[in-house]
Amino acid sequence: ALDTNYCFRNLEENCCVRPLYIDFRQDLGWKWVHEPKGYYANFCSGPCPYLRSADTTHSTVLGLYNTLNPEASASPCCVPQDLEPLTILYYVGRTPKVEQLSNMVVKSCKCS
Amino acid sequence: ALDTNYCFRNLEENCCVRPLYIDFRQDLGWKWVHEPKGYYANFCSGPCPYLRSADTTHSTVLGLYNTLNPEASASPCCVPQDLEPLTILYYVGRTPKVEQLSNMVVKSCKCS
């Protein structure tokens, strides 16, 4: 699986999850998030050669098409597969609110 | 929606579904498919600016991060959203077989 455990160890050049630390204030301008100050959102990148973690029959077909027709610009793309939530603390006036934001952390990638 | 109806009419530069005709024999080397000879598989391409058909909270966050940090190479990617099957005819010896291949045709795209 193209997950953090594999990708962060092996630094694979093809489609893999990459670490990306996002500081809410500095990187997004979100001053309203009190805690955490930032988090590892991660992202997916890298080429998707034929059959690499193909998501659907279409991505398999497109990968083969791209291999046999390399001048074509049609190829699968490396995108998130498994995502996890992030719990944040923010304030409404002086009242603290805890909320779980879904799909905030990329744990693995696929070629789609 | 970034579907064939919209994208094939407007020729949008940002993330959209693009027409792609694949000839089974010529483009894939698949001589075993008897009918159809080819089909419109289509594919997704184009930049994913902030908030364009964002798939998850993560793609929204990543789109904003990329807008504010354009030198970073971390941005969402344009990939298939809705796919449809394709029915094919092939032969096993002299026996005709009809099979429905799932997820063969891209009908719309999203930024993931």
């Epitope: 962060f8 160890r9 630094l11 990459r18 630390y21 | 190479s73 971390a74």
Partner: nanobody, 119 residues
Framework: QLQLVESGGGLVQPGGSLTLSCAAS????????MSWVRQAPGKGLEWVSV????????IYSDSVKGRFAIARDNAKNTLYLQMNSLKPEDTAVYYC????????????RGQGTQVTVSS
């Protein structure tokens, strides 16, 4: 909050050696790859090296390959860069970076440490 503190820079003669250190805190250091980047006077950030989370995979830019060695001590939350056969063109401010700086450019969190190679 994620913090990175670089140290070990200084003035060294061509052909000399230095070892840079980076103390990391505010995140699970052992889970993530780490990188070194540098910024020469009047130039942009240049990726130097990256090391995998367990220290097994190490990749170097062509400009430092064979001269620099990246290492990490996950027990101490510390990243290192052993710099040998230093050249004047290695003069720069060196920063450690969380993650793999081949993919995410233009972002430094620490103050950096100045390395000057001059006779």
């Amino acid at each position: 909050q994620l913090q990175l503190v670089e140290s070990g820079g200084g003035l060294v003669q061509p052909g000399g050696s230095l070892t840079l250190s980076c103390a990391a805190s505010g995140f699970t250091f052992s889970h993530y790859p780490m990188s070194w980047v540098r910024q020469a006077p009047g130039k942009g950030l240049e990726w130097v090296s990256v090391i995998g989370s367990d220290g097994g995979t190490k990749i170097y830019s062509d400009s430092v390959k064979g001269r620099f060695a990246i290492a990490r001590d996950n027990a101490k939350n510390t990243l290192y860069l052993q710099m040998n056969s230093l050249k004047p063109e290695d003069t720069a401010v060196y920063y450690c970076a969380e993650g793999d700086s081949r993919y995410v450019r233009g972002r430094t969190r620490g103050q950096g440490t100045q390395v000057t190679v001059s006779s």
